[in-house]
């Protein structure tokens, strides 16, 4: 299993939207992609989960565009706020 986030950093003005890309490789048939936000304290905050058999996930300002064949799960954060400045991680799990 492998997860790749090619964007090392991204800068966007407040109130705009940003899309963070995540590509993965897996041999699992059924799996989940999780998006987390890392606080300055290094604490990881769960944001949203995309299931391999589920519709595109949406939760508040967070939405996922899932492309199953391309093995791509992009996180969009809309109406950006200053508090959104952070490091974001995607993770793969069964």
């Amino acid at each position: 299993q492998k997860v790749t986030q090619a964007q090392s950093s991204v800068s966007m003005p407040v109130r705009k939207a940003v899309t963070l890309n995540c590509l993965y490789e897996t041999s699992w048939w059924s799996y989940y992609i999780f998006w987390y936000k890392q606080l300055p304290s290094k604490e990881m905050i769960f944001l949203i989960r995309q299931g391999s058999d589920e519709q595109n996930a949406k939760s508040g300002r967070y939405s996922v565009n899932f492309k199953k064949a391309a093995k791509s799960v992009a996180l969009t954060i809309s109406a950006l706020q200053l508090e959104d400045s952070a490091k974001y991680f995607c993770a793969l799990g069964e």
């Epitope: 058999d53 519709q55 492309k67 199953k68 391309a70 791509s72």
Partner: antibody, heavy 117, light 106 residues
């Protein structure tokens, strides 16, 4: 209303190649993958492969590797499938279908390909 | 790959009759999807995530099942329901379709 307009029927000779097109409208072309499906009376519906128009990433059913090549053109919102070294086994109706996870939510009208000498 | 077997392959029903067709998977799948196809037309999305009806699908249709066994039911057959119905899974790669159940009106 999402539309997938496929190219017209093709009559081709054995051994030749053919390139089918699928023009998408009324949605952001790069936001979802385009899949291709083959339908015959014998084998029913079979997934051929898929392309992500945003990145060009493709995935193929092992059965169709070497037979089909998928491409897309973002500027015209069109997906293409080229079939090579055609035989009678390739005579079928071919559909493009837009994947909205987790299923094939929109389908083109189909293109009939007939391989005959 | 996961093989989907639909039964019966061909069936007929009278108007008003209850109709049930099944789809059996060779391995367990999370959800099943169903499409309706009429002659000289492309497949229409019909039921998604096992039991959710696509927009415009009459309420007399329902879907159910889990694991390796799924079904599509029409509570009261109508003439316009005559068509071929295909099940499809996307739990395993590649996505696969069943061979179809052709439903005719008596």
């Amino acid at each position: 209303q999402v539309q997938l307009q496929q190219s017209g029927a093709e009559l081709v000779r054995p051994g030749a190649s053919v390139k089918l097109s699928c023009k998408a409208s009324d949605y952001k072309f790069t936001d979802s993958e385009m899949y291709w499906v083959k339908q015959t009376p014998v084998h029913g519906l079979e997934w051929i492969g898929a392309i992500d128009p945003e990145t060009g990433i493709t995935a193929y059913n092992q059965r169709f590797k070497g037979k089909a090549t998928l491409t897309s053109d973002k500027s015209s919102s069109t997906a293409y499938m080229e079939l090579r070294s055609l035989t009678s086994e390739d005579s079928a109706v071919y559909y493009c279908t837009r994947a909205v996870p987790p299923w094939f939510a929109y389908w083109g009208q189909g293109t009939l390909v007939t391989v005959s000498a | 790959q996961i093989v989907l077997t639909q039964s019966p392959a061909l069936m007929s029903a009278s108007p008003g009759e209850k109709v049930t067709m099944t789809c059996s998977a060779s391995s367990s799948v999370s959800y099943m999807y169903w499409y309706q196809q009429k002659p000289r037309s492309s497949p229409k999305p019909w039921i998604y995530l096992t039991s959710n009806l696509a927009a415009g699908v009459p309420a007399r249709f329902s879907g159910s099942g889990s694991g390796t066994s799924y079904s599509l039911t029409i509570s009261s057959m109508e003439a316009e329901d005559a068509a071929t119905y295909y099940c499809q899974q996307w739990s395993g790669d590649p996505p696969t379709f069943g061979g179809g159940t052709k439903l005719e009106i008596k």
